[in-house]
Interface confidence: medium
């Protein structure tokens, strides 16, 4: 996505040999060299650059596609009802907007790898700041949602029961400013830069290294490992909750929660290990090399990717795992295909209200 | 135009501490790895400190290591050179310089210059 | 440190003249890198990896050598030449200059 060139020591005659005469390839690099000036593996950056120029314009249309079409149809199916939306189905909605808005993105950045970054530097901060907004607010909207679910059923808790769309809408709006304020950065430090070395424009970060180092641990612990932990910690404490009350009801409708946080898991713990070893070697607690840069470039290149595709995933999952959301998605292709028939749009959502567990721990999706 | 404009210079006592300032221009200093470079009056250039382009690697000879600090302000487009401890042969000509790329990387010679600023240490 | 020593330090030459200045290292180096300065002006990159000359050099100046000694050469001597040339070696640190070699108009 955005480029971040990552600072590299000054090469020194030794290696410009070593890099004219090939022998770059095995360089490597301790504590020991960080005295004599301008030590550094000659990485050229042909090898990741060309494989994100193949890659990442194909991956993100596809995405994009998949992403605009999915989250278009979970948001539809929300939207359509005629019931006030549960707490649950209000947080899925700000996560399909969130994703929504992500995967807009997704062309600007696949122009950036193919060619170069050509939207100016006002579109540059918007585009860097709205992919972050979205990646934070996914991440933690899917935490809202467990703590929520955590709630109602280990603690029979309804925090969003009086009032429901004043405490939900009051927590999204939270969780928004809270990932604008994340993306201040971009606002701030997200330029057009002409890069003599590339020899091409691109959409880059313009600070110091101490800082693209705290916004990757910022990016690492509130975009990941505490949504994770949050998520982890709920859905665990939920489980054991619904298996000792032997709630098989519950524990079918639990069912999608949990694929919904396995894939979170799935999808980004890769990308998160490649940003961890990303700051071991800018920490210097990882020595760099060319093999290990170029690997790490390339690893960042299909990991995000891998993310990103999480934009996708979760329509499908409610399509493939969510009874009520193929009801309802049914319903909706049915009504807009025979605007006549309004008989189709009475679903039978109410027994699921009327249900007394559900009132006070409702443990599935609910809308989906 | 590539341009390196240097300031701080001026007279200072031994012991004393002054910081130099160099505002770069005409290309994208984000890039570029910079170093100062001196020259005593009527004598020859003497290497003084280098930084990195993101500012992570830092080097100097060993006559100026813990006396002085070479820094950057990128979002400025801007080099410094703290100065503290400062003895009589410090005197010179303090030059801002630009390290070219090769390859996609920072080379070691310096391929633009500052005009210079003059520091005179003396009590 | 590897010291390099420039010769002469000084040299009076006339215009048209062919005139090599040479730099020896105290120890082996890659490449050597020269620099033109004038009065009161800052260094310009002269010549660069030994050999290859820097953007807006004329042709009459060349560069050579490997190892311990490398040479400026130029040609044809003309007024705008005379300067002080200085050589650079950046293979290990500190990266050091030689002393000059003060060109002048005999």
């Known amino acids: 996505m955005v480029l971040e060139v990552s600072d590299h020591q000054v090469l020194n005659d030794a290696e410009v040999a070593a890099l004219l005469e090939n022998f770059s390839s095995s360089y490597d690099y301790g504590e020991n060299e960080s005295d004599s000036c301008c030590t550094s593996p000659p990485c050229p950056q042909d090898f990741s650059l060309n494989f994100d120029r193949a890659f990442l314009p194909a991956l993100y249309s596809l995405l994009f596609l998949l992403g605009l079409l999915g989250n278009g149809a979970v948001a539809a199916v929300l939207l359509s009802r005629r019931t006030a939306l549960s707490s649950t189905d209000t947080f899925l909605l700000h996560l399909a907007v969130a994703d929504t808005l992500l995967v807009l993105t997704l062309p600007l950045w696949a122009v950036d790898a193919a060619v170069q970054w050509v939207f100016g530097s006002g579109l540059c901060k918007v585009a860097g700041a709205l992919f972050n907004i979205n990646f934070y607010a996914g991440a933690l909207l899917l935490a809202c949602i467990s703590f929520d679910r955590y709630l109602n059923i280990v603690h029979a808790t309804q925090l969003y029961r009086r009032g429901p769309p004043a405490r939900v809408t009051l927590t999204c709006l939270a969780v928004w400013g809270l990932c604008l304020l994340f993306a201040l950065p971009d606002f701030i430090f997200l330029s057009a830069h002409h890069d003599e070395r590339l020899n091409a424009t691109h959409c880059q970060y313009n600070f110091p290294q101490v800082g693209r180092t705290a916004l990757r641990v910022l990016q690492l612990v509130a975009g990941f490992l505490l949504p994770l932990l949050v998520m982890a910690y709920c859905y665990a404490h939920i489980l054991a909750v619904l298996l000792v009350s032997r709630g098989q009801r519950r524990l079918r409708a639990m069912r999608l929660v949990v694929v919904v946080v396995v894939a979170f898991a799935l999808c980004w713990t890769p990308y998160h290990l490649v940003v961890l070893v990303d700051i071991l070697m800018d920490l210097g607690a990882l020595a760099r090399n060319c093999g290990r840069e170029s690997r790490v470039d390339v690893a960042k290149s299909v990991t995000s990717g891998l993310g990103y595709m999480h934009c996708c995933l979760n329509p499908l999952l409610y399509a493939f795992v969510g009874v009520k959301f193929r009801e309802r998605m049914w319903m909706l292709l049915l009504r807009l295909g025979c605007p006549n028939q309004r008989g189709l749009q009475r679903q039978p959502s109410s027994s699921r209200r009327d249900s007394s567990w559900s009132e006070t721990s409702e443990a599935s999706y609910s809308g989906l | 135009e590539v341009q390196l404009l240097e300031s701080g210079g001026g007279l200072v006592q031994p012991g004393g501490s002054l910081r130099l300032s160099c505002a770069a221009s005409?290309?994208?200093?984000?890039?570029?790895?910079m170093s100062w470079v001196r020259q005593a009056p009527g004598k020859g250039l003497e290497w003084v400190a280098t930084?990195?382009?993101?500012?992570?690697?830092?080097y100097y000879p060993d006559s100026v290591k813990g006396r002085f600090t070479i820094s950057r302000d990128n979002a400025k487009n801007t080099l410094y050179l703290q100065m503290n401890s400062l003895r009589a042969e410090d005197t010179a000509v303090y030059y801002c310089?630009?390290?070219?790329?090769?390859?996609?990387?920072?080379?070691?010679?310096?391929?633009?210059w500052g005009q210079g600023t003059l520091v005179t240490v003396s009590s | 440190d590897i010291q390099l020593t420039q010769s002469p330090s000084f040299l009076s030459a006339s215009v048209g003249d062919r005139v090599t200045i040479t730099c020896r290292a105290s120890?082996?180096?890659?490449?050597l890198y020269w620099y033109q300065q004038k009065p009161g002006k800052a260094p310009k990159l002269w010549i660069y990896?030994?050999?290859t000359l820097a953007p807006g050099v004329p042709s009459r100046f060349s560069g050579s050598g490997s190892g311990n000694e490398y040479t400026l050469t130029i040609s044809s001597l003309q007024p705008e030449d005379f300067a002080t040339y200085y050589c650079?070696?950046?293979?290990?640190?500190?990266?050091?200059f030689g002393q000059g070699t003060k060109l002048e108009i005999k």
């Open positions: 930084i990195s382009h993101g500012g992570t690697y830092t």
């Open positions: 650079q070696q950046f293979t290990s640190s500190p990266y050091t």
């Open positions: 990896f030994t050999s």
């Open positions: 005409g290309f994208t200093f984000t890039s570029y790895a």
């Open positions: 310089a630009r390290h070219p790329i090769y390859s996609g990387n920072y080379q070691g010679y310096f391929d633009y």
């Open positions: 120890s082996g180096v890659n490449y």
